[in-house]
Interface confidence: low
Amino acid sequence: GDTRPRFLWQPKRECHFFNGTERVRFLDRYFYNQEESVRFDSDVGEFRAVTELGRPDAEYWNSQKDILEQARAAVDTYCRHNYGVGESFTVQRRVQPKVTVYPSKTQPLQHHNLLVCSVSGFYPGSIEVRWFLNGQEEKAGMVSTGLIQNGDWTFQTLVMLETVPRSGEVYTCQVEHPSVTSPLTVEWRARSESAQSK
Amino acid sequence: IKEEHVIIQAEFYLNPDQSGEFMFDFDGDEIFHVDMAKKETVWRLEEFGRFASFEAQGALANIAVDKANLEIMTKRSNYTPITNVPPEVTVLTNSPVELREPNVLICFIDKFTPPVVNVTWLRNGKPVTTGVSETVFLPREDHLFRKFHYLPFLPSTEDVYDCRVEHWGLDEPLLKHWEFDAPSPLPETTE
């Protein structure tokens, strides 16, 4: 294979937003290979060498009035500006989750099983998934994949409930998400027959 | 206090491959990248282009500066090369799998550097190229990279799939397998 040595330069300009654009932190960061060499932090107000490799750049950029002024103004001219441009399709983006409930394996009643609540295709990632048994919230025996980013501006998550289903029990997966005003709920009823469609 | 949102303008330039990237990231999702060869802005979701514009020429200028800066830093570091970090690979589906219901296989390649990777989808051991798509290299907080590859497919009990990943940090290609699981009862669903 190609075993030549590789050399990587990674600049990153980061805008961190708190409470809308009320508080903004701007970071102008530079990485050689995987190591940060120099950065400007709007909370500091000047360039700082992170490693010795970045010292010449920090000294030079701090000596340049234009560069320093531009970096200090970036919370407004760059961060707040870009937030405003993209707000409607990023910050305000809402996609409702699809919620599906199924047992992980086909088992007769009164056998240990895993009930799966699949929540998929939603945006943003902030979500609350709860399990209820006959109206009472189940807090024990829950296992989750955590939030999975699909890379296409949607998320998914699986929240499993370890249970031994008994006839007549009603299991409910409840999902709260910014795209809906009231929680989404999907019920799964423990029945003796295998098919469980509504 | 944790921030509500983060926007990152992430760039890189890699030698000796002479590959560069310029992209904007919002909370971990790509807003757009600039296609260096075509010199055009590529929106991650087509509708984004209806709300905003980005002048690709500016990114080309940045990449030119990145190239120059990399040369300076390479010299300054006494030609210290990057250490290969191999990827972690996960294959999953976009949504719960139902036989003969269109779905998408996602190959998630994570926590690697440098940003060069060779990814192949295999169906029953043979390469598949129809309908496949991929993201550019996405930044991570630890300054490694992430990447997604997608394969639209029709789930069946006969077909098995692999995502094959090659990276300089791996001794041999890494294959992650996916096949249809034994059927469960029909699911309860809400849209």
Epitope: P56, E59 | A68, I72
Partner: antibody, heavy 120, light 109 residues
């Protein structure tokens, strides 16, 4: 005060190698950010940047001439040397050395220049 | 190789104001500072303006510099006969220093 002075042959033959020395005082080339560059000016023509060496020994060259140029420094002697190979009559020019006080800064002090004629 | 574009010549009468333009691109002027040098006949260039608009000590305030986007300009007010000289702009293109082609300023009269 800062001073720079160029020295080298006034006449070189085509295909020969030109070696110019810039001797400076009033500053140190080991000070972070400082660089010394070479600029030339053919008679009646514009200034053309040739090369620059930084305090940390990074070297930069004009794209069109980089295969012919070599810049080096001797910090203890306060000297910067420029060599230019394969000289041609079109390289006839006044050659200046100048100080850059900061990384990618302006040339704030210049030498008086030395006229180099390339002729057989 | 001349990368920055300047007019070959400008002229003005004593007391007048003249401007000299310097046009570049995003990779040079667009991303970097601009300097201006004055070269009197038979002498070495002298730094006139640095960092777009800063004057070294000893340079009269009749000289001023500005930059907008990928262009820069030098303005001279209250033109005097001793201002007759060649003027050069300079910036950086990636890791290279680049100069303009120079502008000959003639003071009329």
């Amino acid at each position: 005060q800062v001073q720079l002075k160029e020295s080298g042959p006034a006449l070189v033959k085509p295909t020969q190698t030109l070696t110019l020395t810039c001797t400076f005082s009033g500053f140190s080339l080991s000070t972070s950010g400082v660089g010394v560059g070479w600029i030339r000016q053919p008679p009646g023509k514009a200034l053309e940047w040739l090369a620059l060496i930084d305090w940390d020994d990074d070297k930069y060259y004009s794209t069109s001439l980089k295969t012919r140029l070599t810049i080096s420094k001797d910090t203890s002697k306060n000297q910067v040397v420029l060599t230019m190979t394969n000289m041609d009559p079109v390289d006839t020019a006044t050659y200046y050395c100048a100080r850059s006080p900061r990384y990618r800064g302006a040339f704030d002090y210049w030498g008086q220049g030395t006229l180099v004629t390339v002729s057989s | 190789d001349i990368v920055l574009t300047q007019p070959p010549s400008v002229s003005g009468a004593p007391g007048q104001r003249v401007t000299i333009s310097c046009s570049g691109s995003e990779s040079n002027i667009g991303n970097n500072y601009v300097q201006w040098y004055q070269q009197l006949p038979g002498t070495a260039p002298k730094l006139l303006i640095y960092d777009n608009n800063q004057r070294p000590s000893g340079v009269p305030d009749r000289f001023s510099g500005s930059k907008s986007g990928t262009s820069a300009s030098l303005a001279i007010t209250g033109l005097q006969s001793e201002d007759e000289a060649d003027y050069y702009c300079q910036s950086y293109d990636l890791i290279r220093h680049v100069f303009g082609g120079g502008t000959k300023l003639t003071v009329l009269g």
